[in-house]
Structure formats: structure tokens, C-alpha cells
């Protein structure tokens, strides 16, 4: 009966050699795709000269296969019932699922020019950098291929800087041949209700990016949750992409290939201002751009990106305050297309389908010492791209799952 099923589930979701969970955990059986839409700027000169609204047109999808590599350095610690690992990063372009090639060109914000005065707020340094920006013929916007923009290019301005700095720039640089982690997660052997919950990340229990409890590493990595998930439960998970822990709440029941799953969605209040959601006060780390912490829907992750002015939001500034999207024309936020969800099978806690959507933005501010930016009359949080990372359990796996899990319960 139920006790037997519960016992089987408890045994099979433990993260140790020989279990169903472990096999899928080491190397996901799901094909995961990451689709990119690039925001192509239509009026670069007008913006740089007159501080006009930025007109963007999204181009995509450009699709890559990701998360196809198995976890590495897997080490069980029987003492504290944890397993540690690193997740290698890799991306393979999928031409058949893309609107063009990796050589397609886009007009985007010049990442180095925008970041330089933000990182170096000292006038003297800015004057020095300005001479190098001019010498390299760099400006506020640049034309780059998809491949360059995502994975890195040698920046002509940074190449002239006379002290040792990284001269390669890219939204996801470095990515291929890098790893995420070390993650140390509970294997559930002693307590199944802790299975897959992250004990530490990069050797620490906190991130050192945020003040107070915002800095905590909560929950799992969202690939699975402790079993016997109830609709009333808030699913907490950590996402290294956005440098924070976040949560999802029950949205609806879905039938996924004959498997009943719970769709958990990221609620709007996860992106709210401290005014709307006081719990978010520690995610507001600066007062100027955030209009004294009243703006919402964007997250300043600069501390996690070596001080670069990187802001994360939902695509097309979904759930963001009007002041954020006002300087940008051509955005059309849409709940269905742009929200993030996790379809979790409630008995096992396995995420059988997901869509992770996020947008990468760069802050650019007027800088009186940088000629390329001195005509700006206001700061802009400039959308660079948005991504949709999706995975769905395969038909074969779904059948197997039905036979082994849901079928037995019915």
C-alpha cells in the first residue's frame, strides 16, 4: 500500500549510487535548450547624442543546447550525509532551432564603455580611460556578432589599458570549459526532507553579495525538491545565474505526458520593491538608480559580477516598475512568454519540465569625463538579451516514470 510506495520513494530519491534519482541527477536525461533573444538597438546615434529613448527590436530565438555534461568531482560525505560536485558548463549552437547563425550582427550597448565609469568613479581614472576610448574609436554602442556578444570578444578599448585587466568581454564570458560550484547538497540518507537542499556553495553557506538574510543559500538548485510536495509549500531554490535564492509558489495542476504535475511559478512579489514586499529590503543595495528603493523588477547583481553594472530582470521588464521600462521603446512584456515556472511531480519532487526566463541588462549612466557618455541626461538600464532555458522530460522517460511511480500509486 501507501507505506510501501512511500518507502520506495524515500529510498529512490536519495542521492547515492544505485538510486533512480542519482542516475538522473548525475547527468540529466532531459534535453535542455537555452534560447536567446538579442535586443538590437535601432537608434544608437540618437541615444548617444540626444539621450533619446532607446528603441529596441528583439531578434531570436538563437538556440543552444546546454546542461548536457555530467556533474563532476562527485564526492559523498557519509559523516554529514552530503554529496559535493561541480556542474560543467557547455553550450552547443543548434542552427535548426535558430533564426540565424552565430555570425549574425547586432547593435548593442558597448559593455566596456558603459562599465568603465561605473567601476572607476574617480575623475582622474575616467579622463585616462576616455583618452583610450577615443583612441580605440569606441563609442556608446557597438556592433557585435551573436558569438562575440555571448561568449566573448577582445575589446579594443580595454586592450589599450596599460595595467593588467581582462580584455575579453562577453555577457557569459567565460562559459565553455568552466564549472559552476562546488555545490555541497544533502543526499537525504538520514533525512529525506533535506534531499538536494544545498548545504554550501563554493565552500560557503552564504553568498557575501547581499546584506542580512538575502545572502542565504536557500533550498535546492530547482532540478528537484524533497519528495511529497504539497500545493501549500513554497519551493525555495538558489540560482547562481541571478546570484540569489528565490522561491516559487503553486500556480496550477498540469498534465505532463500523462503525469500529474504541480506548476510552481515565480510570483511578482519576488521582484517587488521593499515598499510592496518588506522582505526584499536587503536586495536593494543602492538608493539612486532604485529611486530610494521604490523601483521594482530589476536586481542589481554588480557585487556578484566584479562590480560591473549588471541588472537582472524578467524578459521585457515583466513585473518591473514603469520608471525602469520608460526609457526603452519596443518592449512587450507578456506573462505567458516571460514568466518562469517549474513543473514538479509532487510524489518524487522531481522537476519534470521547466522554463527559466531572465533578462540581462547593463546600467549606463551619464559620465562627464567619458565623451561617449557625456551627452546622456539620465541613467538607462539597457536590455541586452533575454533567455528562455527549457527542459521537458522525454517521452520514453515519461513512460518509464508513469510505470515506476504514478502508475503504481493509481
Amino acid at each position: 500500500g501507501d507505506m510501501l510506495i512511500e518507502k520506495t520513494i524515500k529510498r529512490e530519491v536519495v542521492l547515492e549510487e544505485g538510486t533512480t534519482a542519482f542516475k538522473n541527477w548525475v547527468k540529466t536525461g532531459t534535453t535542455v535548450y537555452r534560447q536567446f533573444w538579442i535586443f538590437d538597438v535601432q537608434n544608437p546615434d540618437d541615444v548617444a547624442k540626444n539621450s533619446s529613448k532607446i528603441k529596441v527590436k528583439q531578434r531570436g530565438p538563437y538556440t543552444y543546447r546546454v546542461r548536457y555534461l555530467a556533474k563532476e568531482n562527485i564526492t559523498q560525505d557519509p559523516e554529514d550525509h552530503t554529496v559535493s560536485f561541480v556542474q560543467p558548463n557547455g553550450a552547443i549552437f543548434e542552427p535548426s532551432l535558430s533564426v540565424g547563425t552565430e555570425d549574425d550582427n547586432f547593435t548593442v550597448l558597448n559593455l566596456a564603455v558603459a562599465a568603465a565609469p561605473h567601476i572607476y568613479q574617480n575623475s582622474f581614472v575616467q579622463v585616462v580611460l576616455n583618452s583610450l576610448i577615443k583612441k580605440s574609436k569606441s563609442s556608446m554602442f557597438q556592433t557585435r556578432s551573436l558569438k562575440e556578444l555571448l561568449w566573448g570578444y577582445k575589446d579594443p578599448f580595454l586592450s589599450l589599458v596599460p595595467y593588467p585587466i581582462s580584455t575579453t568581454v562577453g555577457v557569459f564570458y567565460p562559459y565553455n570549459d568552466t564549472v559552476d560550484g562546488v555545490y555541497k547538497v544533502f543526499n537525504g540518507k538520514d533525512n529525506i526532507s533535506k534531499v538536494a537542499i544545498i548545504e554550501s556553495y563554493k565552500g560557503k553557506r552564504n553568498l557575501s553579495y547581499w546584506p542580512s538574510y538575502c545572502d542565504m543559500i536557500n533550498g535546492t538548485d530547482a532540478a528537484s525538491f524533497p519528495p511529497f510536495v504539497e500545493k501549500s509549500r513554497t519551493l525555495r531554490f538558489f540560482s547562481s545565474d541571478i546570484c540569489r535564492s528565490i522561491y516559487a509558489v503553486f500556480g496550477s495542476e498540469i498534465d505532463l505526458k500523462g503525469i500529474p504535475v504541480y506548476r510552481f511559478v515565480l510570483p511578482a512579489n519576488a521582484f517587488a520593491s521593499p515598499l510592496q514586499n518588506p522582505d526584499n529590503h536587503c536586495f536593494c543595495t543602492e538608493k539612486v538608480i532604485s529611486n530610494n528603493c521604490t523601483s521594482y523588477g530589476v536586481l542589481d547583481i554588480g557585487k556578484c559580477k566584479e562590480g560591473k553594472p549588471v541588472y537582472i530582470s524578467l524578459p521585457h521588464f515583466l513585473h518591473a516598475s514603469p520608471d525602469v521600462s520608460e526609457p526603452i521603446e519596443g518592449l512587450h512584456p507578456n506573462e505567458d512568454e516571460h514568466r518562469t515556472y517549474l513543473d514538479v511531480e509532487p510524489i518524487t519532487g522531481f522537476t519534470l519540465q521547466f522554463a527559466k526566463r531572465l533578462q540581462v541588462n547593463i546600467l549606463v549612466k551619464p559620465a562627464r569625463k567619458i565623451e561617449a557618455l557625456k551627452n546622456l541626461k539620465r541613467p538607462y538600464i539597457v536590455p541586452i538579451l533575454w533567455l528562455n532555458e527549457t527542459g521537458t522530460i522525454g517521452d520514453e522517460k515519461a513512460e518509464m516514470f508513469k510505470t515506476q511511480v504514478t502508475g503504481k500509486i493509481k
Epitope: 582622474f124 583618452s131 596599460p162 595595467y163 562627464r368 557625456k374
Partner: antibody
Framework: QIQLVQSGPELVKPGASVKISCETS????????MHWVKQSHGKSLEWIGG????????KYNQKFKGKATLTVDKSSSTAYMELRSLTSEDSAVYYC???????????WGQGTLVTVSA | ETTVTQSPASLSVATGEKVTIRCITS??????MNWYQQKPGEPPKLLIS???TLRPGVPSRFSSGGYGTDFVFTVENMLSEDVADYYC?????????FGAGTKLELK
């Protein structure tokens, strides 16, 4: 409060070198540029160069390249300027001056008189 | 290099009178001009920074204006304590360059 204290007066022979120090307190040393300024007797001010202690980046006035070398010791929050191959033309008061982000030469040392004489 | 031409070289003014010092630059520097006061035996003191910004604690009788290549520094009511040398500094580009200075004396 912010203070810049320079080393005492120097009397040096032509052809020799001299190293002037500027010890700072009351601020985060690495975050602000330290400049050096020359003032010959009864004359105007000349910018020699600046150093950003955070990464050691220096920029010199072309006129003083080869004459002045700027360095910092972050552990003691001290900036140094070495002047070499001294001639009577180098006799002057030398000031260190510190920026405040977007404000140039917001704070000054008291000056160091260098006299080059045989 | 941007050269800065300051005039007059010296100025003798009675107490309560208005003082005007001018600096002209060889290149357009927007409003990146600064003004310093130096009293005998002392280092210079910043009075007005870029953008014609009066520094905190500096009396409001001091002001400046100008944009591009032509800049003016004004003392509204001359006081005896204002006797000093005054220098302008362009901070738009490197090398930073000072004007030759104006010696302000009391009549």
C-alpha cells in the same frame, strides 16, 4: 579628518636624486588618486602626474616623464615621488594633492621644498 | 595639450569692490574648470570645482561662470582676507593645466 603630511625640506646636489613622501590618513587610501604638483618660486603650478593606488595606474605630464617616478605603499597609505638627475631648474616646492572622486585636488599636503645647489 | 591663458596677472582692488578674473582655454573643455586660492606659505585651496560648483564652506561672494573656452571667476565684495593668488585649472583632459595665476592685492 583627511590629512596629507609631506616629508621635510631637502637640499640636494645637482645630478642626485630625491624621494619625497606624502603620508595620508582619514580616508580609504586606495580609492583616490594622488597627484603631485610643482611650484617654482614665485611661479604658477604645474601638474607632474597622478597615481591611482587601487591598481597602481600612473599618468605623467610628458614634461616630467623620466624626471619623476610616482609610487605608493598601500600598507602605510603613503605616496612617494622620486625626482632624478636634479638640476637647479628642479628647485621648487612640491605638493601632493588628493582627489575626491569628481573633485580635483580637494586636499593638499603642506608642500616640500627641494633646493638643488652645489 | 590644452593651454590656459589667465588674466590679469595682478589686480589691485579696494575693499567691497567686485573682482573679475578670466581664463581662456585653447580647446573646448565644457565646464571642466576649477578655481584655487593660495595664500603665502600655504598650499592652494579649492574654491570652485567643475560645473561652477562652489565647494562647501566657501563664502558665497565667490562664484564662477563660463562654458567651452571662456571662463570667469568673480569675487563680489572684496575683503582683506581675499588677498591671495588665484589659479584656474582645466580638468577636461591630460595633462591637467593651470593658468599662470592672478595676484589679488588690496588697494
Amino acid at each position: 579628518q583627511i590629512q596629507l603630511v609631506q616629508s621635510g625640506p631637502e637640499l640636494v646636489k645637482p645630478g642626485a636624486s630625491v624621494k619625497i613622501s606624502c603620508e595620508t590618513s582619514g580616508h580609504t587610501f586606495t580609492e583616490y588618486t594622488m597627484h603631485w604638483v610643482k611650484q617654482s618660486h614665485g611661479k604658477s603650478l604645474e601638474w607632474i602626474g597622478g597615481i591611482y593606488p587601487n591598481n597602481g595606474a600612473t599618468k605623467y605630464n610628458q614634461k616630467f616623464k623620466g624626471k619623476a617616478t610616482l609610487t605608493v605603499d598601500k600598507s602605510s597609505s603613503t605616496a612617494y615621488m622620486e625626482l632624478r638627475s636634479l638640476t637647479s631648474e628642479d628647485s621648487a616646492v612640491y605638493y601632493c594633492a588628493r582627489d575626491r572622486y569628481d573633485v580635483w585636488f580637494a586636499y593638499w599636503g603642506q608642500g616640500t621644498l627641494v633646493t638643488v645647489s652645489a | 595639450e590644452t593651454t590656459v591663458t589667465q588674466s590679469p596677472a595682478s589686480l589691485s582692488v579696494a575693499t567691497g569692490e567686485k573682482v573679475t578674473i578670466r581664463c581662456i582655454t585653447s580647446t573646448d573643455i565644457d565646464d571642466d574648470m576649477n578655481w584655487y586660492q593660495q595664500k603665502p606659505g600655504e598650499p592652494p585651496k579649492l574654491l570652485i570645482s567643475e560645473g561652477n560648483t562652489l565647494r562647501p564652506g566657501v563664502p558665497s561672494r565667490f562664484s564662477s561662470g563660463g562654458y567651452g573656452t571662456d571662463f570667469v571667476f568673480t569675487v563680489e565684495n572684496m575683503l582683506s582676507e581675499d588677498v591671495a593668488d588665484y589659479y584656474c585649472l582645466q580638468s577636461d583632459n591630460l595633462p591637467l593645466t593651470f593658468g599662470a595665476g592672478t595676484k589679488l592685492e588690496l588697494k
